[in-house]
Interface confidence: low
């Protein structure tokens, strides 16, 4: 029977530790059923619409680059973007829109309107999230687009503002 | 030892392709452990409190009839619904309710007030989502009730309105 | 090889049920592969801004005690919790905050601002939530802060405030 | 379990002030509205007005230039003063916490005016 | 301000009977309704608050249902201790006003 000697290719994991051929439970417990996720928080500083993330966060089987989480194994995933929005009202209302993209498409958006009454207050805090369920193929992308980014408020709450992926079902 | 001419009934899936009876990392890969989860867009025409939904969404181990989604594998599930409101303020606030179901009981709402300041916006862009964990059986149903549907956004947005569902753990 | 009558500890869960060594199928349906989840609703009288939950809820492989969810296996875990507000409004307008906090350091936290016109409605309905994914080590413990909590709105929507945590990979 | 309780002389002459206090007791003042509502003989109830903690009040339009509420967070009690009063202001006076509708009570003061 | 009227302002019911009290609002109130149960020389008891929830402690036969402006009070099954004063109130807007009130009397 298939040893820990099985050579290290994507598909074929070596079963870690130990030589445990013979142990089924053993054999089970380690067993490659391959998960991915990532859970990155946004940059400190936006200039655009798309949003950039901070690369120093969670990522195992996903890659990150230029504002993309970029899949890595193929399957139904599960995506997630919270943020926090900081308003200065203006005299009218403000919409704030999320936008979560696929490929640069547009999946799915979440909008709220605030500053509803005007001047009647300072500042107004939001919070806006969105989810995904979808099927991702290899080298799929996933971003996100805020038109408000300006209002996105990185300084009090750094940690507020999250993009994160996981793998529900992989598509062996 | 078993082969892949298990014979193909719920709980004896036949391990796909090839025969690698030999072979356990082969077997562990093709392993049916049992997911099911479905994700459903609000049909674009809604005319009660009971949200109707796009039934050629996602669907896998799920059945949806007449509004609910019906589960066929029992376990503990993450159920989530998430909807975009459109209100057009009349002069007095307005409070957005969303009922997850199980079986027809209400097991969890949300509820906001929009239009607070009465008439100083046209509209006001509402996003509202609910969660539930909770364990289900074969044939439970899980839908969804808002008051008022007629403000929920399926023009602008016919993408942003959903039901879903995954099985978490299974009570094999 | 390995058998039912594997010691029962934590790491050598018996395979349930009948003897089944030699049918690889059967073995892999019972595989001890860990899950832990919670979900618990919010205690009816709440007096201090720590929240306490009632421990009738659902609880497997995590633990309750003075406020915490007490984690018992490593892993990485997905935390959420989802709180409704009922707010008289007074003359300003008030800020609603939910922190989670990991081992007493707030990891995460959403705000969201109310009664921004005023006396114009008596009572404001808010539904906030916050997630996180995160590692978790053995006896972490997880709890959430609410500084304005008196308006956690626990006699009419007692089910609608939880906190819920489900481990996504364990770090075997 | 909350309690309330009004204090408060029982008989004010026509045109002086009508002095309550209430005392909460078993749970803080903090985060709720509080209520004076009033009953006069043989008939039904009215709302005075309300404070929050923060001190922010609001009262009955057809009592609003007589009414005072305050409150004292550090002793856990809100008072009423109701100034220029006349027989038609004898009343049984209730306070009460406003969390939705009054959940709480006090056992009520009568307070009579005459002279 | 928003006029608070209950119907009957007197009932007669024994023992056993089911009785419903109807409070009617000058307008819309959403559900910001609630009931207190009254007796002779003691402050008002909240039963019933936002239209049909039952506060704590108060015993089942007690119901509350209605939308909007129109509202009802039900006893299932009147006990010895149910004969009192009964009230509605609305604090949907300022300032908050009660209903005149219903004497329920043993028949």
């Known amino acids: 029977q298939r040893t820990d000697s099985i050579p290290n290719s994507p598909d074929n994991i070596p079963l870690r530790g130990g030589n445990c051929s013979e142990d089924l439970l053993c054999i089970l417990k380690r067993a490659p059923f391959k998960k991915s996720w990532a859970y990155l928080q946004v940059a400190k500083h936006l200039n655009k619409t798309k949003l950039s993330w901070n690369k120093d966060g969670i990522l195992h089987g996903v890659r990150y680059q230029d504002g993309n989480l970029v899949i890595q194994f193929p399957g139904l995933y599960f995506i997630i973007c919270q943020l926090q929005f900081l308003v200065q009202c203006p005299n009218n209302s403000v919409d704030l829109k999320l936008e979560l993209l696929i490929n640069k498409h547009i999946k799915k958006q979440a909008l709220v309107t605030v500053c509803e009454s005007g001047m009647q207050t300072k500042h107004v805090y939001q919070n806006l999230s969105q989810f995904l369920l979808d099927y991702l193929q290899v080298n799929t992308t996933v971003s996100v687009n805020v038109d408000t980014f300006q209002y996105i408020d990185t300084s009090t709450f750094p940690l507020e503002n999250v993009l994160s992926v996981f793998l529900y079902s992989n598509s062996d | 030892q078993r082969t892949d001419s298990i014979p193909n009934s719920p709980d004896n899936i036949p391990l796909r392709g090839g025969n690698c009876s030999e072979d356990l990392l082969c077997i562990l890969k093709r392993a049916p452990f049992k997911k099911s989860w479905a994700y459903l867009q609000v049909a674009k025409h809604l005319n009660k409190t009971k949200l109707s939904w796009n039934k050629d969404g996602i669907l896998h181990g799920v059945r949806y009839q007449d509004g609910n989604l019906v589960i066929q594998f029992p376990g503990l599930y993450f159920i989530i619904c998430q909807l975009q409101f459109l209100v057009q303020c009349p002069n007095n606030s307005v409070d957005l309710k969303l009922e997850l179901l199980i079986n027809k009981h209400i097991k969890k709402q949300a509820l906001v007030t929009v239009c607070e300041s009465g008439m100083q916006t046209k509209h006001v862009y509402q996003n509202l989502s609910q969660f539930l964990l909770d364990y289900l059986q074969v044939n439970t149903t899980v839908s969804v009730n808002v008051d008022t549907f007629q403000y929920i956004d399926t023009s602008t947005f016919p993408l942003e309105n959903v039901l879903s569902v995954f099985l978490y753990s299974n009570s094999d | 090889q390995r058998t039912d009558s594997i010691p029962n500890s934590p790491d050598n869960i018996p395979l349930r049920g009948g003897n089944c060594s030699e049918d690889l199928l059967c073995i892999l349906k019972r595989a001890p592969f860990k899950k832990s989840w919670a979900y618990l609703q919010v205690a009816k009288h709440l007096n201090k801004t720590k929240l306490s939950w009632n421990k009738d809820g659902i609880l497997h492989g995590v633990r309750y005690q003075d406020g915490n969810l007490v984690i018992q296996f490593p892993g990485l875990y997905f935390i959420i919790c989802q709180l409704q507000f009922l707010v008289q409004c007074p003359n300003n307008s008030v800020d609603l905050k939910l922190e989670l906090l990991i081992n007493k350091h707030i990891k995460k936290q959403a705000l969201v601002t109310v009664c921004e016109s005023g006396m114009q409605t008596k009572h404001v309905y808010q539904n906030l939530s916050q997630f996180l994914l995160d590692y978790l080590q053995v006896n972490t413990t997880v709890s959430v802060n609410v500084d304005t909590f008196q308006y956690i709105d626990t006699s009419t929507f007692p089910l609608e405030n939880v906190l819920s945590v489900f481990l996504y990979s364990n770090s075997d | 379990q909350v309690q309330l309780q009004e204090s408060g002389p029982g008989l004010v002459k026509p045109s002086e002030t009508l002095s309550l206090t209430c005392t909460v007791s078993g749970g803080s003042i903090s985060g709720y509205y509080w209520s004076w509502i009033r009953q006069p003989p043989v008939k039904g109830l009215e709302w005075i007005g309300y404070i929050f903690y923060s001190g922010y009040t609001k009262y009955n339009p057809s009592l609003k230039s007589r009414v005072t509420i305050s409150v004292d967070t550090s002793k856990n009690q809100f008072s009423l003063k109701l100034s220029s009063v006349t027989a038609a202001d004898t009343a049984v006076y209730y306070c009460?916490?406003?969390?939705?509708?009054?959940?709480?009570w006090g056992q009520g003061a009568l307070v009579t005016v005459s002279s | 301000a928003i006029q608070m009227t209950q119907s009957p302002s007197y009932l007669s019911a024994s023992v056993g009977d089911r009785v419903t009290i109807a409070c009617r609002a000058s307008q819309g109130i959403r559900n910001n309704l609630g009931w207190y149960q009254q007796k002779p020389g003691k402050a008002p008891k909240l039963l019933i608050y936002?239209?049909?929830s039952l506060q704590s402690g108060v015993p089942s036969r007690f119901s509350g249902s209605g939308s909007g402006t129109d509202f009802t009070l039900t006893i299932s099954s009147l006990q010895p201790e149910d004969f009192a004063t009964y009230y509605c109130l609305q604090d949907f807007n300022y300032p908050y006003t009660f209903g005149q009130g219903t004497k329920l009397e043993i028949k």
């Open positions: 009460a916490r406003d969390r939705w509708d009054f959940d709480y």
């Open positions: 936002a239209e049909s």
